[in-house]
């Protein structure tokens, strides 16, 4: 027999069926030109000493073979003795070490068996009623196809599925969508209505994330506020990576879960922009303000569940950085200025009302004054910090106020509003005899003492009504009692107490008269 022809003789080997799992498989035969045909197959197992024979039985019942040696591909013409217009049954017999292994057979009409291409190029993936929809352009001149898919997860082997017949310029397939695991899909096509014809190769992997992106399991820590008024947010625990099927472990697009950080600055609500979204890799610096931080996971199907944390405000206060002068026209604050053209946000809130929204004011960009200070003024009519109570004041600064991550804390302090001089006056001043020449003076704490860092000291004044001599005694802001010594019996005294702040002298309390009784000896 000539090598170019199918040989109508008994094959040159004895048949001893090996029954082994290895051997020839995946035989496919198709037309490659107007008169040319090709069959190819895979061989599984050791290839040394293996001879392959392509077997063919015609519709007439006559059978022949092509000897291909070690090759697993054969090209032949329509003159090779194989009928190309009628149905033929083909299979491969591989002979080695006196054993024969047979491939599954294919039955087809060679002339009609065109080599179909798998879906090529961009396969669009979308979600439709809880299922996966894949769509692609039909390869040129190949309208009319049967389509199959196979899919696997990281822990399962391939499962085969059917997309049904396709007869249009675009083809599509509905496939199962997994809720919580990634999947790898591949598609293949063959000519519609020719069951025996060969399938195309499998397409490139289509990597599909789970319907639900994984819950982001991350932990944050916030560093101390630095001298620049900023603190770094750091990621202590990275989100767990999604387990991927084998074909999706390289840089396969489509299966990625992206994590984004959504930052919401709760302090200073009057600023232009309160929320910013940035990639998780780009951990920001924050001011000392309070923030809500959310980590949002999303994949090609959209956002998934998020995890939210509250980052409390940094409560570290600087008692001396802020100067407040109260005049007849109103109040002005002074503080060490930042760079040129800085916008400041001044926020205040009554102490004890931290749950409610703070009041704030945004200054126009300002440069430092000649003394290097920045200022903010308000009139009495505005009512700002007008009530006689303790306010927590925070000042934030930014050269780019619309960029949420560029704000920094300038200072955080307390201020007693309204007429602090009068409101801070100590009440319930009482005098008790202490010894023959001394008394103990007590008073109720000043309202100013509720305001951390505001009360600088108490001053107790004692006046001798006979001589009009006055003595003043400074008392620590934490004390509400003092002992006055070296007093004379029988002399009338008046005592008064006032509470001073760093920038304001308090008003004296009502004078309290007392005297030490003269001791009459027996």
């Amino acid at each position: 027999c000539r090598t170019s022809e199918c040989c109508f003789q008994d094959p040159p080997y004895s048949d001893a069926d090996s029954g082994s799992a290895s051997g020839p498989r995946d035989l496919s035969c198709y037309r490659i030109s107007s008169a040319g045909y090709e069959c190819s197959w895979q061989y599984e197992g050791p290839t040394a000493g293996v001879s392959h024979f392509l077997r063919c039985c015609l519709s007439s019942g006559r059978c022949c073979y092509f000897a291909t040696g070690s090759a697993t591909r054969l090209q032949f013409s329509d003159q090779a003795g194989v009928s190309v217009l009628h149905t033929v049954t083909l299979w491969v017999e591989s002979w080695a070490r006196n054993r024969t292994e047979k491939s599954p057979e294919v039955t087809l009409q060679l002339y009609k068996s065109v080599k179909y291409k798998p879906p090529l190029g961009d396969i669009k993936v979308s979600k439709l009623a809880g299922q996966l929809r894949m769509e692609w352009e039909t390869p040129d001149n190949q309208v009319g196809a049967e389509v199959q898919f196979r899919h696997r997860t990281p822990s399962s082997s391939w499962k085969l599925g059917d997309c049904g017949p396709q007869d249009d310029d675009t083809e599509s397939c509905l496939c199962p969508l997994e809720m919580n695991v990634a999947q790898e899909f591949q598609l293949r096509r063959r000519r519609l209505g020719s069951q025996g014809s060969s399938w195309s190769k499998w397409s490139s992997p289509v990597c599909v994330p789970p319907e639900n992106p994984p819950q982001p399991q991350v932990r944050f820590s916030v560093e101390q506020l630095g001298r620049d008024g900023r603190r770094r947010l750091t990621l202590k625990e990275q989100p767990t990576q999604l387990e991927l099927p084998e074909g999706c472990q390289g840089p396969a697009p489509g299966v990625e879960v992206t994590y984004q950080l959504q930052l919401h600055m709760l302090s200073c609500p009057c600023k232009a922009k309160a929320t910013r979204t940035l990639p998780l890799e780009k951990m920001p610096y924050l001011s000392g303000a309070a923030y809500n931080v959310a980590v949002i996971s999303s994949n090609r199907f959209g956002p998934g569940p998020n995890q939210t944390w509250h980052i409390p405000a940094d409560t570290h206060t600087e008692p001396v950085a802020l100067n407040i002068s109260v005049g007849t026209n109103g109040t002005t604050m002074y503080w060490p200025a930042r760079a040129q053209s800085t916008t400041y946000c001044i926020e205040w809130q009554p102490v004890g009302q931290e749950g409610s929204l703070a009041t704030c004011n945004l200054t126009a960009p300002q440069d430092p004054d000649p003394a290097g200070m920045a200022t903010y003024s308000w009139s009495r009519e505005s009512g700002a910090m007008g009530q006689e109570k303790c306010y927590h004041i925070t000042i934030f600064a930014s050269a780019h106020p619309k960029k949420l991550t560029l704000w920094s804390t300038v200072l955080s302090t307390y201020h007693f509003g309204g007429n602090a001089s009068a409101a801070g006056t100590p009440h319930h001043v009482s005098v008790k005899n202490h010894s023959l020449d001394s008394v103990s003076v007590d008073w109720a704490p000043s309202l100013l003492s509720t305001c951390p860092g505001v009360l600088k000291e108490y001053v107790v004044r004692c006046r001798d009504e006979d001589s009009n001599q006055v003595s003043e005694h400074p008392v620590q802001p934490t004390e509400t009692q003092v002992t006055l010594s070296d007093l004379r019996a029988g002399v009338a005294y008046t005592v008064q107490v006032r509470a001073d702040t760093a920038w304001l002298r308090g008003a004296w309390s009502q004078p309290q008269r007392f005297s030490i009784k003269v001791q009459v000896s027996d």
């Epitope: 008994d10 069926d17 039985c57 019942g61 059978c63 299979w91 057979e105």
Partner: nanobody, 124 residues
Amino acid sequence: QVQLVESGGGLVQAGGSLRLSCLASGRTSNYFMGWFRQAPGKEREFVAAISRSGGGTWYADSVKGRFAISRDNAKNTVNLQMNSLKREDTAVYYCAADRRTGTSVYTVDEYDYWGQGTQVTVSS
């Protein structure tokens, strides 16, 4: 060693139908299978054959369109559905297994294993 047992033969009127079945004792999914028949005083002749997967089928011209061969590899059976039976279909029908598939599917000598046969009689 494969053993084949035919069943389903019998007496039937012309124009009627019969279904022959062949049960194999061994694994025959790797063999081409065929049905042959032998009328009294005549040589054994080819009726139909089927490839290993069932994708390829072959028939003698005299039975084309009337007989249908099928197989169920899971059950190790091969069936021959015979419709529109004629008097000349009367014969002993044999099931055969071709382990090797040589030069044709219809040559008696190609087949390695044979059953004992089942009688089909078509009366007028």
